[in-house]
């Protein structure tokens, strides 16, 4: 009885089970009752990658430089040529017949996976705590600056597109400014005291001094802000006095309206 099915690596033709041609070879003639299947090797620029009964080998793929392609792996009689894209480009499809430039991740997005010759850039939105302020095919989302590690505080919150803005802490500023101001005041006070002492010791020209009761001198009266009825003079951080603006009444602890 003629066979209805053949073994692996065989095919049925004219009631005969014939051997398939091995990879890298094409079919020249089917087997007969008296002869084996005849196969011939594929030529230099051709291939067949399976056990087959093909009468023609397939042409190797051409990696067209005009389409941005280059050879990644040269074809053999058993394998096709593998093309890939030039730097900065990736394949448009799985078959890689042409190439397109890698896309850039816009601000607010970072590179999750850098593009290869066969895959495009994969972008991801920058999560909270990260930002990207550039359009790039390489840069990942960067973490916000940590103000704490620099002994600073956040003055402006970060976004997915901007970093945080750091500034000095209020307490820290006070710790620096107050001792400086106190130091300056102390020096001024000393100078005033020395000056007053000198003035007090100066003898009157020829005029005899009438006997007077010792008078308590209140040095504080001469100091700014010692008169509760007088307006308080504003000062800048640098301890410089601010002159009262013309046309404005002096008011204590009254906030100006914006």
């Amino acid at each position: 009885e003629p066979p209805t099915a053949c073994r692996e690596k065989q095919y049925l033709i004219n009631s005969q089970c014939c051997s398939l041609c091995q990879p890298g070879q094409k079919l020249v003639s089917d087997c007969t009752e008296f002869t084996e299947t005849e196969c011939l090797p594929c030529s230099e620029s051709e291939f067949l990658d399976t056990w087959n009964r093909e009468t023609r080998c397939h042409q190797h793929k051409y990696c067209d430089p005009n389409l941005g392609l280059r050879v990644q792996q040269k074809g053999t009689s058993e394998t096709d040529t593998i093309c890939t894209c030039e730097e900065g480009l990736h394949c448009m499809s799985e078959s890689c017949e042409s190439c397109v430039p890698h896309r850039s991740c816009l601000p607010g997005f970072g590179v999750k996976q850098i593009a290869t010759g066969v895959s495009d850039t994969i972008c991801e939105p920058c999560p909270v705590g990260f930002f990207s302020n550039v359009s790039s095919a390489f840069e990942k989302c960067r973490p916000w600056t940590s103000c704490e590690t620099k002994d600073l505080v956040v003055q402006q919150a970060g976004t997915n597109k901007t970093d945080v803005v750091c500034g000095p802490q209020d307490r820290q500023r006070a710790l620096v400014v107050i001792p400086i101001c106190l130091g300056i005041l102390f020096v001024i006070l000393l100078l005033v005291l020395v000056f007053i002492k000198k003035v007090a010791k100066k003898p009157n020209d020829k005029a005899p001094h009438p006997k007077q009761e010792p008078q308590e001198i209140n040095f504080l009266d001469d100091l700014p802000g010692s008169n509760p009825a007088a307006p308080v003079q504003e000062t800048l951080h640098g301890c410089q006095p601010v002159t009262q603006e013309d046309g404005k009444e002096s008011r204590i602890s009254v906030q100006e309206r914006q």
């Epitope: 051997s19 020249v28 089917d30 009752e33 008296f34 002869t35 084996e36």
Partner: antibody, heavy 112, light 112 residues
Framework: EVQLQESGPGLVKPSQSLSLTCSVT?????????WNWIRQFPGNKLEWMGY???????NYNPSLKNRISITRDTSKNQFFLKLNSVTTEDTATYYC?????WGQGTSVTVSS | DIVLTQSPLSLPVSLGDQASISCRSS???????????LNWFLQKPGQSPQLLIY???NRFSGVLDRFSGTGSGTDFTLTISRVEAEDLGVYFC?????????FGSGTKLEIK
């Protein structure tokens, strides 16, 4: 159905050449198979002489040395046997065959 | 060359009997692909040989299942299960594994 038919002279003089034609119908000799010449001597002994393949290449029985030539005419779907320098020992019935199909044979006598 | 030795040279049988013919090769007929190109032919009186069995055991189209072939390597057998009058003639084995192709000397099947 595949059919083969031999033709040629029935009588050849010694030292001359024997030329036979095989006409094939029902199958192209360029498609596949080996197209053989076989002879049968008196007393039934069979001898394979040689073949021409579908692609035109040949293979001959070394016993026939350089006396044998098998050619073909693909336009007429025919193949040919030429045997040079015949002797009386070449007297036989000559068959052309694809092996699964045979011609009816032609008797050739070598005699002066 | 491969020598094929057939036995017996003559086989007298009664109609309806089983007949077995042996063909021994001087070397293995199995090729590198594992195929064995050993064939059996019947030549009826006044006719050209006709193919019965190819590749040891495969019946050619139209051949009755009374005919079967077995064997491997160098030993092969053709068996006719129930001989009929139309089976009479000379049986040949032929190997086409190696060039030159060679025939057995033939076995004549005749009525007792």
């Amino acid at each position: 159905e595949v059919q083969l038919q031999e033709s040629g002279p029935g009588l050849v003089k010694p030292s001359q050449s024997l030329s036979l034609t095989c006409s094939v119908t029902g199958y192209s000799i360029t498609t596949n198979y080996y197209w053989n010449w076989i002879r049968q001597f008196p007393g039934n002994k069979l001898e394979w002489m040689g073949y021409i393949k579908y692609d035109g290449s040949n293979n001959y029985n070394p016993s026939l040395k350089n006396r044998i030539s098998i050619t073909r005419d693909t336009s007429k779907n025919q193949f040919f046997l030429k045997l040079n320098s015949v002797t009386t020992e070449d007297t036989a019935t000559y068959y052309c065959a694809r092996l699964d199909y045979w011609g009816q044979g032609t008797s050739v006598t070598v005699s002066s | 060359d491969i020598v094929l030795t057939q036995s017996p040279l003559s086989l007298p049988v009664s109609l309806g009997d089983q007949a077995s013919i042996s063909c021994r090769s001087s070397q293995s007929l199995e090729n590198s692909n594992g195929n064995t190109f050993l064939n059996w032919f019947l030549q009826k009186p006044g006719q050209s040989p006709q193919l019965l069995i190819y590749k040891v055991s495969n019946r050619f189209s139209g051949v009755l299942d009374r005919f079967s072939g077995t064997g491997s390597g160098t030993d092969f057998t053709l068996t006719i299960s129930r001989v009929e009058a139309e089976d009479l003639g000379v049986y040949f084995c032929l190997q086409v594994t190696h060039v030159p192709f060679t025939f057995g000397s033939g076995t004549k099947l005749e009525i007792k």
